[in-house]
């Protein structure tokens, strides 16, 4: 007498489920359930999600749409795709910025902030990998610069001092005479 039997909805098409008193067709993506059907295998009353709300999937029981997320300006986020009735806002970083996850196990829904990409040119280095999902990967020093500690230092143009090997093209020729 527990009422554990859940009768199968024997309707044409497979997107029917018992809602209210009958098996009803669910609502399409971008619509919420206003009222269940009032006949076997009938159509539920579905309404379009209001502005700034969405439902991404076909559904039977959502009587309201989910609120669209706002991109976090404090974290320098921007909207890559605006919210629609069927999809949430897609937040990301503007060009020249990359995503820095705020948790160690990073997934698409993880909180993040945007960081400005390293400018390899300003560091006098080659750009090995352009910045997108992670920071720019800078390579070796540009011509006319040599490695010194952590940075790239401009090659000397005078012959008075020593001429580093990487700078032969700049100052080395003068030492041949």
């Amino acid at each position: 007498q527990g009422g554990t039997r859940s009768p199968r909805c024997d309707c044409a098409g497979d997107f029917h489920k018992k809602i209210g008193l009958f098996c009803c067709r669910g609502c399409p993506a971008g619509h919420y359930l206003k009222a269940p059907c009032t006949e076997p295998c009938g159509n539920s009353t579905c309404l379009v999600c209001p502005q700034d709300t969405f439902l991404a999937w076909e559904n039977h029981h959502n009587s309201e749409c989910a609120r669209c997320q706002a991109c976090d300006e404090q974290a320098s986020q921007v909207a890559l795709e605006n919210c629609s009735a069927v999809a949430d806002t897609r937040c990301g970083c503007k060009p020249g910025w990359f995503v820095e996850c705020q948790v160690s196990q990073c997934v698409s829904s993880s909180p993040f902030y945007c960081q400005p990409c390293l400018d390899c040119g300003a560091l006098h280095r080659h750009t090995r990998l352009l910045c997108s999902r992670r920071d720019t990967d800078c390579g070796t020093c540009l011509p006319g610069f040599y490695e010194h500690g952590d940075g790239c230092v401009s090659c000397p143009t005078s012959t008075l001092g020593s001429c580093p090997e990487r700078c032969a093209a700049v100052c080395g020729w003068r030492q041949m005479f």
Partner: antibody, heavy 120, light 111 residues
């Protein structure tokens, strides 16, 4: 054993209000759709309202806006709040359980009913 | 709303008789391969009791002398051999749509 026991009936003046209760036992109340059905003396049966297990309510036009069905699963109870009562609402009111094998409304257990008389 | 018309409104019969009650709906109550017609028995001062669901399915515990048939708008409840405990009023009910409606009843009396 499935049992449905109605209470709350009585004599009320036209325009008055009454709240009927139905105490359910012997089954998992929250899993079932429930209805109220009434029967005027010597007359046929008339469906009055239904409350589905997933929380939806349904009414015929004759009582919509005047009657409100509700349920309290924790108390295994079904209720019918009747407002703006008319002489035509005089009847025995039955609480009925919908069959769990059915994805359509058919009533497999009924209470013994409670009499509502609307008269001045 | 779907109107349900039962006939006859009353009948007299003897124990052992074959009894047929009909119910006509104002529009078809059949859809999606099913006929949404049900039958109840009610004895004086008692609550209704479900006999038949979906036009022809016998409810658990109901004697096999009761049977139902029909589709569309015309349905029949048959008692193959009337027993003393069968003297009662019988109602049809549809669940093809809301509101649910019942027939006016057929009273089966002892001849």
């Amino acid at each position: 054993e499935v049992q449905l026991v109605e209470s709350g009936g009585g004599l009320v003046q036209p325009g008055g209000s009454l709240r009927l209760s139905c105490a359910a036992s012997g089954f998992t109340f929250s899993n079932y759709d429930m209805s109220w059905v009434r029967q005027a003396t010597g007359k046929g049966l008339e469906w009055v309202s239904a409350f589905s297990s997933d929380g939806y309510t349904f009414y015929p036009g004759s009582v919509k806006g005047r009657f409100t069905i509700s349920r309290e699963n924790a108390k295994n109870s079904l209720y019918l709040q009747m407002n703006s009562l008319r002489a035509g609402d005089t009847a025995v009111y039955y609480c009925a359980r919908h069959a769990d094998y059915a994805n359509y409304p058919v009533m497999d257990y009924w209470g013994q009913g409670t009499l509502v008389t609307v008269s001045s | 709303d779907i109107q349900m018309t039962q006939s006859p409104s009353s009948l007299s019969a003897s124990v052992g008789d074959r009894v047929t009650i009909t119910c006509r709906a104002s529009k078809s109550v059949s859809t999606s391969g099913y006929s949404y017609m049900h039958w109840y028995q009610q004895k004086p001062g008692k609550a209704p009791k479900l006999l038949i669901y979906l036009a022809s399915n016998l409810e658990s515990g109901v004697p096999s002398r009761f049977s139902g048939s029909g589709s569309g708008t015309d349905f029949t409840l048959t008692i193959s051999s009337l027993q003393p405990e069968d003297f009662a009023t019988y109602y049809c009910q549809h669940s093809r749509e809301l509101p649910l409606t019942f027939g006016g009843g057929t009273k089966v009396e002892i001849k």
